[in-house]
Structure formats: structure tokens, C-alpha cells
């Protein structure tokens, strides 16, 4: 039931950043800061913001929005012991 | 009884690489996010990262790059490569179920 | 996030009443705040989580309050098994977790 909810917010997610230009989005995140400063996953590298390419643009945004979700679960898990948020690994490779 | 085990602690050369195990006994740690500590001698503690159980692993901004966080559920185990070392990597190295669990920790010394 | 405890050293008497703070830089992700014992050549101890909220096992001498960017531990009355150093730690969704700089109790 999770896993669904997580895919429609991603698709919602999704949807939201489509209807932003480019370069809106872009001034958005800047203005914004959005990402932190965080690292990610084995080849998950965050790119520099001033890609101007939407893709790109989308991609980054995107994997540090995933980030900071996986992020906040951890923190709730083990610093709020909230263990209904904790990822399991079941189905996930 | 329910412990963490770190080792592959020693003395390494600035610039070499180590890979430290953390090796569970008495519980699975599969289901369990997976935490690296550090704590510099005489010094307070330091967040490296965490690695989740599905294997995706992050890490504080000073140890991207350098420290990667893997995990093998079959050995119940979870690693951390460190590469590129310096001096002031020098420490002993936690690895801790969640944070209510922690090893006993293994002493890396930095120096050539 | 920087987490800031003060004093970094408290010289105390066994059953005194003793409070340390941890004030956070920006406010605590969630207020998940916790707090943590370390004793020399020991690894750290959790004690609280979520600022307030008692670990299984942790004498009820030990409480947590605070919320946003001030937190306090207190022991109600402090015990010989009570000397130690303790760490704050707090959520953040930049940096993951961030820990205070320690306060060591000692024996006056």
C-alpha cells in the first residue's frame, strides 16, 4: 500500500515538474536551495544546477527530492523510532 | 547474545584505502537501516552516512567521494570502503543498528 | 545544522539534579532530537529519542524536553554510574545527523 502511495506522489511529483519551464524551475530551485548538500547513493553524484538542458534539470532536482525523502525516513526511524517508515528490503532489487 | 562486531581496523598510510566489516550476531540486521560513526581520540562523535535495506547509501557531505557504505544481507554484514585516507581520518569507527545498537568499535590510525 | 551543548564539562555530586542543554543552529527535522551516555573505550548509549521520549531500559532519573533549536537532558538525581559524557544529536535533512559537541560529566 506504501509502494503505491510512493508512486503516485512520484508521479504527482512528476506531473508538477512538466508544467514548469525549464527555466522557471531552474530560478525556483536556486531561489529556493533546494537539494542540501547531502550524498547520495553509489553513482548518484549531484549535478551543478546550471545545466540548462530540462532533462537534466529534472533529473537532478528529482534524485534530490528522493534524497531527502529516504532522508527523512531514516531520521524518523532512528531518532523518532517511528518503525513503520523504515525501508524494507523486500522486492526492492 | 545480541552484539555488533567491527573489525579490519589498523594503521594505513595517508592516500591508502581500508574496508572496514560490521558483522551482526543474534539478530538479522536486513530490515535495519545500517549507521557509520566516527569519533576522532578525544574527540566528540561524527556522522559518516547510512545505508538502507534495499542497499541505496548516504552519506554526510565531508565523506561523499571518499567512504562508501555497501551491505551484504546474505553475510549479515555492512562495510565501509574508505579511500584516499588522511591523517585526520585517524579514529575509531562505529557502525550502530539503527542508533539504539552500536559495535564496539575498531581503531583506524592514519600515519606514515 | 551545527549542535551546540553547554557546558562542555559539569562537575556535579552524586544525587545532585543536573541539566544540560543542546541548542541547534536551525530547527530540529521533526524534533528528533536524541540524546546519548558514552563512557571512556565504550561505545555511545541511547538514552532519548525524540527529545522526550524514554529508551526501553533507561532509568526514569533521565528526561528530555525542549523542541525547535533548545533541547535539555536532566538527571533527576544523579547516580554514580551516571558519570560519563553525553551527545546530543539531531535530525537534518542535509546532512543526515548532526551531533553536539558533548558535555562531560564529572566528579566534583
Known amino acids: 500500500r506504501r509502494d503505491v502511495a510512493h508512486g503516485i506522489l512520484n508521479e504527482a511529483y512528476r506531473k508538477v515538474l512538466d508544467q514548469l519551464s525549464a527555466g522557471k524551475h531552474l530560478q525556483s530551485l536556486v531561489a529556493r536551495g533546494v537539494g542540501g548538500s547531502l550524498g547520495g547513493g553509489a553513482g548518484d553524484d549531484a549535478e551543478p544546477l546550471s545545466k540548462r538542458h530540462s532533462d537534466g534539470i529534472f533529473t537532478d532536482s528529482y534524485s534530490r527530492y528522493r534524497k531527502q525523502m529516504a532522508v527523512k525516513k531514516y531520521l524518523a526511524a532512528v531518532l523518532g523510532k517511528r518503525y513503520k517508515q523504515r525501508v524494507k528490503n523486500k522486492g526492492r532489487r | 547474545e545480541v552484539q555488533l562486531v567491527e573489525s579490519g581496523g589498523g594503521l594505513v598510510q595517508p592516500g591508502g584505502s581500508l574496508r572496514l566489516s560490521c558483522a551482526a550476531s543474534?539478530?538479522?540486521?536486513?530490515?535495519?537501516?545500517m549507521t557509520w560513526v566516527r569519533q576522532a581520540p578525544g574527540k566528540g562523535l561524527e556522522w559518516i552516512g547510512f545505508?538502507?535495506?534495499?542497499?541505496?547509501?548516504y552519506y554526510a557531505s565531508w565523506a561523499k567521494g571518499r567512504f562508501t557504505i555497501s551491505r551484504d544481507n546474505s553475510k549479515n554484514t555492512v562495510y565501509l570502503q574508505m579511500n584516499s585516507l588522511r591523517a585526520e581520518d585517524t579514529a575509531v569507527y562505529f557502525c550502530?543498528?539503527?542508533?539504539?545498537?552500536w559495535g564496539q568499535g575498531t581503531l583506524v590510525t592514519v600515519s606514515s | 545544522q551545527v549542535l551546540t551543548q553547554s557546558p562542555s564539562t559539569l562537575s556535579a555530586s552524586v544525587g545532585d539534579r543536573v541539566t544540560i542543554t543542546c541548542q541547534s543552529s536551525?530547527?530540529?527535522?521533526?524534533?528528533?532530537l536524541a540524546w546519548f551516555q558514552q563512557k571512556p573505550g565504550k561505545a555511545p548509549k541511547f538514552l532519548i529519542y525524540?527529545?522526550?521520549k524514554l529508551e526501553s531500559g533507561v532509568p526514569s532519573r533521565f528526561s528530555g524536553s525542549g523542541s525547535g533549536t533548545e533541547f535539555t537532558l536532566t538527571i533527576s538525581s544523579l547516580q554514580p554510574d551516571d558519570f560519563a559524557t553525553y551527545y546530543c544529536?539531531?535530525?537534518?535533512?542535509?546532512?543526515?545527523?548532526?551531533f553536539g559537541g558533548g558535555t562531560k560529566v564529572e566528579i566534583k
Open positions: 536551525e530547527s530540529v527535522y521533526g524534533n528528533y
Open positions: 525524540e527529545a522526550s
Open positions: 544529536a539531531g535530525g537534518d535533512i542535509s546532512e543526515g545527523v548532526a
Open positions: 550502530a543498528r539503527d542508533l539504539d545498537l
Open positions: 545505508i538502507d535495506a534495499g542497499g541505496d547509501a
Open positions: 543474534g539478530i538479522d540486521l536486513n530490515s535495519y537501516y
